[in-house]
């Protein structure tokens, strides 16, 4: 039994790193494999991760961390029963991907504007709360091609566009994701898409002179 | 509960021995790392000792080394503090402590025993 | 090694109060910092660690905040059980981690 690919891990900057590895072939990873993980100089027991399938030859292990201090640096030990098949380290800091906003509504009590919110992801405790910037993907169920994304470079977690730059009696998708600069992050997953129907109806001047127009055809 | 029990604390003349003991109860003593944490008369804390939890890495400040030596017996659920060529300044309680889960601040203490160190 | 300053080393103050204590470092330590409590003739008792997490069971009346050399205790709303002497301790890097020399919160 080999290790194919070596681990990668990520962390969400929080409470979970994730680490994924292929083997040399089909593995029951969590009956074969155990991944220890244990901060330097830290001088109780390593703790261990049972890892999980990630299709036939590869593996998914989620490690269980206190909250992330960006000098942490662990050691990751992969062992077989008895035998050590790799041994590597990972420092959360240098390898985050964001925790997915969630809650992401959409707003269209008010005519002419569509205000999109969603909730950070971190308590405002976690150093990320106030470090993250989002993209928001708009995209129309009907037609492919109308596809947006609008990046947010604010810290506020909200949007507003004019419901005139979306087509009128159709119905759109929205998702958003974060990333946050001053760790370098990938960016998160997209959050669940919310759903909405854009009935947008211009003012009356444009529906007056619209149809008179089309009268005289 | 959480306990830890500390015993073996007494007068002891300069240039003596004696040993600590620390009896642990209420968690799973081998997967921790333990220390000796000492307090003289009126003053601060002082980490004297630290060892992990299979006991094959240990550490001392300079004032200590090669004077003191910790110890642990997992099967005992036992920490120990030997202690010779004591000096007046030793003269302190000394505390045991357990490291906590995730980081190596001291989560939970013993009650302390007193060591005097006279003549 | 590295050393830590606390200041103040005592402070007299009311019930009610709202108290703060401050412990620098000599290096930086990122947020690897322990604050406890300590009543005369007894045990320290765990309050902070990683700067600003509060240990299982401590009142949120108590808060921590800081990183790299400078670090602050807070307490909101002194309560007569508060009375004590506080310290701060680093766990950055090897173990030969040190605690400030301590502050006496007295009653005014």
């Known amino acids: 039994m080999k290790v194919l690919q070596e681990p990668t891990c990520v962390s969400d900057y929080m409470s979970i790193s994730t680490c994924e590895w292929k083997m040399n072939g089909p593995t029951n990873c969590s009956t074969e494999l155990r991944l220890l993980y244990q901060l330097v100089f830290l001088l109780s027991e390593a703790h261990t991760c049972i890892p999980e399938n990630n299709g036939g030859a590869g593996c998914v292990c989620h490690l269980l961390m206190d909250d992330v201090v960006s000098a942490d640096n662990y050691t990751l030990d992969l062992w077989a029963g008895q035998q050590l098949l790799w041994k590597g380290s990972f420092k959360p800091s240098e390898h985050v991907k964001p925790r997915a906003p969630g809650n992401l509504t959409v707003h269209t009590n008010v005519s002419d504007t569509l205000l999109l919110t969603w909730s950070n992801p971190y308590p405002p405790d976690n150093y990320l709360y106030n470090h993250l910037t989002y993209a928001v993907n708009i995209w129309s169920e009907n037609d492919p091609a109308d596809f947006r994304i609008y990046n947010v470079t604010y810290l506020e977690p909200s949007l507003r566009i004019a419901a005139s730059t979306l087509k009128s009696g159709i119905s759109y998708r929205a998702r958003v994701r974060a990333w946050a600069q001053c760790y370098n992050t990938t960016w998160s997953e997209w959050s669940p898409s919310t759903k909405w129907h854009n009935s947008y109806r211009e003012p009356f001047e444009q529906h007056h002179h619209h149809h008179h127009h089309h009268h005289h055809h | 509960e959480v306990q830890l029990v500390e015993s073996g604390g007494g007068l002891v003349q300069p240039g003596g021995s004696l040993r600590l003991s620390c009896a642990a109860s209420?968690?799973?003593?081998?997967?921790?790392?333990m220390s000796w944490v000492r307090q003289a008369p009126g003053k601060g804390l002082v980490l004297v000792a630290t060892?992990?939890?299979?006991?094959?890495?240990?550490s001392y400040p300079d004032s200590v080394k090669g004077r003191f030596t910790i110890s642990r017996d997992n099967a005992k659920n036992t920490l120990y503090l030997q202690m010779n060529s004591l000096r007046a300044e030793d003269t302190a309680v000394y505390y045991c402590?357990?490291?906590?889960?995730?980081?190596?601040?001291?989560?939970?203490w013993g009650q302390g025993t007193l060591v005097t160190v006279s003549s | 090694d590295i050393q830590m300053t606390q200041s103040p080393s005592s402070l007299s103050a009311s019930v009610g109060d709202r108290v703060t204590i401050t412990c620098r470092t000599s290096e930086n330590i990122y947020s690897y910092l322990a604050w406890y409590q300590q009543k005369p003739g007894k045990a320290p008792k765990f309050l902070i660690y990683n700067a600003k997490t509060l240990a299982e069971g401590v009142p949120s009346r108590f808060s921590g905040s800081g990183s790299g050399t400078d670090f602050t205790l807070t307490i909101s709303s002194l309560q007569p059980e508060d009375f004590a002497t506080y310290y701060c301790q680093h766990y950055y890097g090897p173990p030969t981690w040190t605690f400030g020399q301590g502050t006496k919160v007295e009653i005014k």
């Open positions: 060892i992990n939890s299979n006991g094959g890495s240990t």
């Open positions: 402590a357990r490291f906590f889960r995730f980081r190596n601040a001291m989560d939970y």
């Open positions: 209420g968690f799973t003593f081998s997967t921790y790392g």
